[in-house]
Amino acid sequence: HNTTVFQGVAGQSLQVSCPYDSMKHWGRRKAWCRQLGEKGPCQRVVSTHNLWLLSFLRRWNGSTAITDDTLGGTLTITLRNLQPHDAGLYQCQSLHGSEADTLRKVLVEVLADPLDHRDAGDLWFPGESESFEDAHVEHSISRSLLEGEIPFPPTS
């Protein structure tokens, strides 16, 4: 898998998208996990609704949300109030039984100052551009974030 780089601005929200083959992954729940080290496990942050038919509903863990367009084949993760410690390697996963297929490897980069990256096209219209080695960058100023995994989010 190539790694896709998504860049967001500290304090703002970042939206990560993971396209997939909707037929191949029909009926499967999805998850967003954080890679712990280069060879370490991928720690689950949030997963889609336990009822696949309701995967379109936003599910939150702390300030990270996940929603799945199962017909269009796009998993969307929102990282709200992006912080420097959110930078790192993540994965979008498709779950089946106790197994998980990687849909996309994602490198989240947190920019300190939007003026440092002033290309209006990048800032306002998320797009892709080829970068070093096997990574490509998606600049985005979108919506949402991640705090440590909690089993059941607070009530409000």
Partner: antibody, heavy 118, light 112 residues
Framework: QVHLQQSGPEVVRPGVSVKISCKGS????????MHWVKQSHAKSLEWIGV????????SYNQKYKGKATVTVDKPSSTAYMELVRLTSEDSAIYYC???????????WGQGTTLTVSS | DVVMTQTPLTLSVTIGQPASISCKSS???????????LNWLLQRPGQSPKRLIY???YLDSGVPDRFTGSGSGTDFTLKISRVEADDLGVYYC?????????FGGGTKLEIK
């Protein structure tokens, strides 16, 4: 403080339609979906359907497909449910309840009483 | 659809005494993610339902620890160790493991 405010009671004739509203406040409205639940003497509580306030997608209990349509107006933080071709069987209290991913129905509206009578 | 059956229909309890409500489902509520989406609501007289217990045994915020939820598979129980006047109302179990969500018929708790 999370609050779901529903529209007032309705008394209507059989065969007409009615639209019930549910306004959310005290939280970011588009963060959580909205469910609709029917409470009647005959059938206790029944789940009707749900709408994503974020993307507008919906899902319905098969039993209520064609009977209920749920919509959302993001600017006013309001969810709606329209019930069509009303009969006496539709007389009930209708609740909106907030979705909370892991376990929905964490907050409920006060209920809207619908009476269908000729 | 999954059928949720509650017993008893009505429960008459003296203040300070324990109470127990049973809820049985027509299919196992253990989900493939390892969680069991069995939950309890309380509807006090003249009020909207209120979430009480979720995922079998987790108490919602503000719910006193006199309440306990237990069970697995298809058999579940809600227990109140010492009933108080504030506990009267109708208790509903409901499941979120299978589509669509379904509710039990309710158990009315009365104070003797």
């Amino acid at each position: 403080q999370v609050h779901l405010q529903q529209s007032g009671p309705e008394v209507v004739r059989p065969g007409v339609s009615v639209k019930i509203s549910c306004k959310g406040s005290g939280y970011t409205f588009t963060d959580y979906g909205m469910h609709w639940v029917k409470q009647s003497h005959a059938k206790s509580l029944e789940w009707i359907g749900v709408i994503s306030t974020y993307n507008g997608n919906t899902s319905y209990n098969q039993k209520y497909k064609g009977k209920a349509t749920v919509t959302v107006d993001k600017p006013s933080s309001t969810a709606y449910m329209e019930l069509v071709r009303l009969t006496s069987e539709d007389s009930a209290i209708y609740y909106c309840a907030r979705d909370f991913g892991y376990v929905p129905f964490d907050y409920w509206g006060q209920g809207t009483t619908l009476t269908v009578s000729s | 659809d999954v059928v949720m059956t509650q017993t008893p229909l009505t429960l008459s309890v003296t203040i300070g005494q324990p109470a127990s409500i049973s809820c049985k489902s027509s299919q196992s509520l253990l989900d493939s993610d390892g969680k069991t989406y069995l939950n309890w609501l309380l509807q006090r007289p003249g009020q909207s339902p209120k979430r009480l217990i979720y995922l079998v045994s987790y108490l919602d915020s503000g719910v006193p620890d006199r309440f306990t939820g237990s069970g697995s598979g298809t058999d579940f129980t809600l227990k109140i160790s010492r009933v108080e006047a504030d506990d009267l109302g109708v208790y509903y179990c409901w499941q979120g493991t299978h589509f669509p969500y379904t509710f039990g018929g309710g158990t009315k708790l009365e104070i003797k």
